[in-house]
């Protein structure tokens, strides 16, 4: 597999440092290549674990830049995929350079949940909206999904009040607290003047990958009135 | 196992024709024995399948009659048991005579269900009471029992009306129709003067053994009045 | 009476399994099945029991005198345990046929281990709604 | 992160199961598990899968370099699949250890066949009441 792609012993150098980065389920392959007198073009192929006839599938063909978005080639984000890149200069092709095994769910990053905070009677209601990811151009939430093991299993919610911080945990599979759009957390408020500041992060099932932490949102309670 | 029970070559004849009969879960062992100048006594032993340390257990010791009630030695009536009988004359013992494999549920007989019949509005209600059996001295119904595969799975109910007979089937596991005491069947009645005669039999799960058929009970409908 | 009963009695004769010494040293399956009432626990145990019988029947596949009995029993097992569902039976058979000494099978098994483990606990009993637009489908 | 994850990644290195050729010829278990949503169907399949892993681990019991990983994973399997219930695990292990070529085991299996078959279909889903005084208890 590390031999030449087509022709005999090749004078075309192999791409180096093939890496994959993923943000919100959008994996992009990067590689490096030495400066050549003639402009090289690259072909990127992807192989997925768990596809019936697992073969190397073309993701980008004869491109000149050094990256390739392979999000259309991701099946179950818990499954592994591998990438290989070859260079072509004129009629000659290099050997393939291969990536390490990559699993979008294990090795990628997920953006933060969005937060909303409001006062209702004697409690503060916190809405935690599941992070949105773009899959095949569709915006979707990283909600519990019986079809994959890649979903946010728990939210860590950090509540600061007058300097002291309490951490709450919300299990996303508990239907009382969560639906496919958001989770809710109710916090009783004391009657004192207090500022409540809240941030949250999700923890993905299996690999325990943590999403980015949300920006802190605050609410101030004056006796029983509210100042956002 | 067919050798002598204690002493050397025995001149004491072996019992013959060891058979088991069971009615309403009460198995009794019978055997035959030749006439002897000295009165013989018999020991009956039982071995059950499914008992942890399966050994021959004494059921009747040194009895002079030719039968032995072994109902205290029945575990799950679906499980097999075997019986062996030896004779003793004075100090000498015979070899054991052994029964065939016997399963109370497969090889025994069960008495009939009891029936009750009455008219309610525009239908006849038939109550089918599960046959009673005596297990370890306790009266119990042959109701569906998740602890054993030996229970009445279905009742065949035969309804005769003016010469023609219809057969109904009642599944005992359907809670709408049955409980631990009885099953119920509702039959719509025509407005004509008619006599309805009903009998029923149970069919046991697995071996499909049929209980005895109940006596026929009848009810006569005059327009909308009843004569039992 | 289900068709398997007569054929199983026939097999008992063939294997001399109606003799009293068969009772020695307890039961194989019946005692274990008595321990588990919960349907999913029963299926865990029955899965092993059924695969044992299929292996046993395979060992006697060349014995013509019991072929009809074996086929009838297998058929009834497929009806009762697999609900006559050929796909369920085929998937089950694939699993029972994997060779634990095959290097490629070993590597695949280890590769899949994390995801298999992640699914071992029963799914949350919430009857959790399924999104109309499912996530992460490739 | 559950303890098994790190140890399973360790096993992947040991078995070279992270290389792309491991993807050839489809999945062993994951594809099958995707087919079955119903909890009892999943248990039928998972029962076979778990017994496969236990056999695989047994084959490598003398390999000291992966013993800690294997033990951690087995422990986590016991927690997840057997709900930390030792009796369940023991019954399961008994079933997986019966030898299909042992004559006494064969005879017992055939003796028990009728009753095993009678219990194969799921119990009536009625939540049927259980009598206080159970029938036929020996």
């Amino acid at each position: 597999e590390m031999g030449t792609a087509d022709l005999g012993p090749s004078s075309v150098p192999t791409p180096t440092n093939v890496t994959i980065e993923s943000y919100n389920m959008n994996p992009i392959v990067y590689w490096e290549y030495q400066i050549m007198p003639q402009v090289p073009v690259f072909t990127v192929e992807v192989k997925n674990y768990g596809v019936k006839n697992s073969e190397w599938i073309d993701a980008c063909i004869n491109i000149s830049h050094h990256y390739c978005n392979i999000s259309d080639h991701v099946g179950d984000p818990s499954n592994s995929l591998w990438v290989r890149v070859k260079a072509r200069v004129g009629q000659k092709e290099s050997a393939y350079a291969k990536s390490e095994e990559f699993a979008v769910c294990r090795d990628g990053k997920i953006g933060p949940p969005k937060l909303d905070i409001r006062k209702e009677e004697k409690q503060i209601m916190i809405d935690i909206f599941h992070p949105s990811v773009f899959v095949n151009g569709d915006e979707q939430e990283v909600d519990y999904d019986p079809e994959t093991t890649c979903y946010i299993r728990v939210y860590n919610v950090y509540v600061r009040m007058n300097g002291s911080e309490i951490q709450y945990k919300i299990l996303t599979q508990k239907e009382d607290d969560c639906d496919e759009i958001q989770c809710q957390l109710a916090i009783p408020v004391s009657s004192l003047n207090s500022q409540y500041c809240v941030s949250a992060e999700g923890v993905l099932h299996v690999w325990g990958v943590t999403t980015e932490k949300s920006k802190e949102v605050c609410i101030t309670i004056f006796n029983s009135s509210i100042k956002g | 196992e067919m050798g002598t029970a204690d002493l050397g070559p025995s001149s004491v004849p072996t019992p013959t024709n060891v058979t088991i009969e069971s009615y309403n879960m009460n198995p009794i062992v019978y055997w035959e024995y030749q006439i002897m100048p000295q009165v013989p006594v018999f020991t009956v032993e039982v071995k059950n399948y499914g008992v942890k340390n399966s050994e021959w257990i004494d059921a009747c010791i040194n009895i002079s009659h030719h039968y032995c009630n072994i109902s205290d030695h029945v575990g799950d009536p679906s499980n097999s048991l075997w019986v062996r009988v030896k004779a003793r004359v004075g100090q000498k013992e015979s070899a054991y005579a052994k029964s065939e494999e016997f399963a109370v549920c497969r090889d025994g007989k069960i008495g009939p269900p009891k029936l009750d019949i009455r008219k309610e509005e525009k239908q006849i209600m038939i109550d089918i009471f599960h046959p009673s059996v005596f297990v370890n001295g306790d009266e119990q119904e042959v109701d569906y029992d998740p602890e054993t595969t030996c229970y009445i799975r279905v009742y065949n109910v035969y309804v005769r009306m003016n010469g023609s007979e219809i057969q109904y089937k009642i599944l005992t596991q359907k809670e709408d129709d049955c409980d631990e005491i009885q099953c119920q069947l509702a039959i719509p009645v025509s407005s004509l003067n008619s006599q309805y005669c009903v009998s029923a039999e149970g069919v046991l799960h697995v071996w499909g053994v049929t209980t005895e058929k109940s006596k026929e009970v009848c009810i006569t409908i005059f327009n909308s009045s009843i004569k039992g | 009476q289900d068709p398997y009963v007569k054929e199983a009695e026939n097999l008992k004769k063939y294997f001399n399994a109606g003799h009293s010494d068969v009772a020695d040293n307890g039961t194989l399956f019946l005692g274990i099945l008595k321990n588990w009432k919960e349907e999913s626990d029963r299926k865990i145990m029955q899965s092993q029991i059924v695969s044992f019988y299929f292996k046993l029947f395979k060992n006697f596949k060349d014995d013509q005198s019991i072929q009809k009995s074996v086929e009838t029993i297998k058929e009834d097992m497929n009806v009762k345990f697999f609900n006559s569902n050929k796909k369920k039976r085929d998937d089950f058979e694939k699993l029972t046929n994997y060779s634990v000494t095959d290097l490629n099978v070993q590597r695949k098994a280890i590769h899949e281990l994390i995801q298999v483990m992640a699914e071992l606990s029963p799914a949350a009993k919430t009857g959790k709604r399924k999104r109309s637009q499912m996530l992460f489908r490739g | 992160q559950d303890p098994y994850v790190k140890e399973a990644e360790n096993l992947k290195k040991y078995f070279n199961a992270g290389h792309s050729d491991v993807a050839d010829n489809g999945t062993l278990f994951l594809g099958i598990l995707k087919n079955w949503k119903e909890e009892s169907d999943r248990k039928i399949m998972q029962s076979q899968i778990v017994s496969f892993y236990f056999k695989l681990f047994k084959n490598f019991k003398d390999d000291q370099s992966i013993q800690k990983s294997v033990e951690t994973i087995k422990e986590d399997m016991n927690v997840k699949f057997f709900n930390s219930n030792k009796k369940k695990r023991d019954d399961f292990e008994k079933l997986t250890n019966y030898s299909v070529t042992d004559l006494n085991v064969q005879r017992k299996a055939i003796h028990e066949l009728i009753q095993v078959m009678a219990e194969l279909s799921p119990a009536a889903k009625t939540g049927k009441r259980k009598r206080s005084q159970m029938l036929f208890r020996g």
Partner: antibody, heavy 123, light 112 residues
Framework: EVQLLESGGGLVQPGGSLRLSCAAS????????MSWVRQAPGKGLEWVSA????????YYADSVKGRFTISRDNSKNTLYLQMNSLRAEDTAVYYC????????????????WGQGTLVTVSS | NFMLTQPHSVSESPGKTVTISCTRS????????VQWYQQRPGSSPTTVIY?????PSGVPDRFSGSIDSSSNSASLTISGLKTEDEADYYC??????????FGGGTKLTVLG
């Protein structure tokens, strides 16, 4: 080559009866489950009835249960469908079909199909 | 009982690829095999895909079948369309309680 040849169709009045036959050749008839599938004029396919290879198990669609009876004679390699209490909505081409996979006692998929026989129920 | 829903009709030009879907109304599409039958006008049905994705011998590899659990549907894909592919296509599955269900059928028109 596997061949299935249906016969016995025709015009019958509502409430009447008809018996369809399907003569099979080119395979071990008793090893395969068999089925009847029908197709009303201009409409889709509807499974009607099935029978196991031995003939011991039979299955019916709700729409024909109690009126139709499937049977087979393995010595004659023939499948039958006895149709009683016929209704206008039973009008269709009736196909006999062999199970596509042997050794599975309920049909699993249908292959091949016969050429069909037309049953018309009309007064 | 579940239903299998197919589009009434699809059309595409020769040489192109067409996909016909078959959506199961309840229960999992993956838990029983799905078959696909082709019925040309005036002829009996013939199998083009069995057991989700298997092709009988004699059926060209332009025909492929797949299952998508997320949409609870099966698909028949025909690539390199030819005029002879013009026909009605039916999906079929078993319902787990001794009934065999067919989809309503899809009329494929090859344009031109």
């Amino acid at each position: 080559e596997v061949q299935l040849l249906e016969s016995g169709g025709g015009l019958v009045q509502p409430g009447g009866s008809l018996r369809l036959s399907c003569a099979a050749s080119g395979f071990t008839f008793s090893s395969y489950a068999m089925s009847w599938v029908r197709q009303a004029p201009g409409k889709g396919l509807e499974w009607v009835s099935a029978i196991s290879g031995s003939g011991g198990s039979t299955y019916y669609a709700d729409s024909v249960k109690g009126r139709f009876t499937i049977s087979r004679d393995n010595s004659k390699n023939t499948l039958y469908l006895q149709m009683n209490s016929l209704r206008a909505e039973d009008t269709a081409v009736y196909y006999c079909a062999k199970d596509g996979s042997s050794g599975w006692y309920v049909p699993h998929w249908f292959d091949p199909w016969g050429q069909g026989t037309l049953v018309t129920v009309s007064s | 009982n579940f239903m299998l829903t197919q589009p009434h009709s699809v059309s595409e030009s020769p040489g192109k690829t067409v996909t016909i879907s078959c959506t199961r109304s309840s229960g999992s599409i993956a838990s029983n095999y799905v078959q696909w039958y082709q019925q040309r006008p005036g002829s009996s049905p013939t199998t083009v895909i069995y057991e989700d994705n298997q092709r009988p011998s004699g059926v060209p590899d332009r025909f492929s079948g797949s299952i998508d659990s997320s949409s609870n549907s099966a698909s028949l894909t025909i690539s390199g369309l030819k005029t002879e592919d013009e026909a009605d296509y039916y999906c079929q599955s078993y319902d787990g309680s001794n009934r065999w269900m067919f989809g309503g059928g899809t009329k494929l028109t090859v344009l031109g």
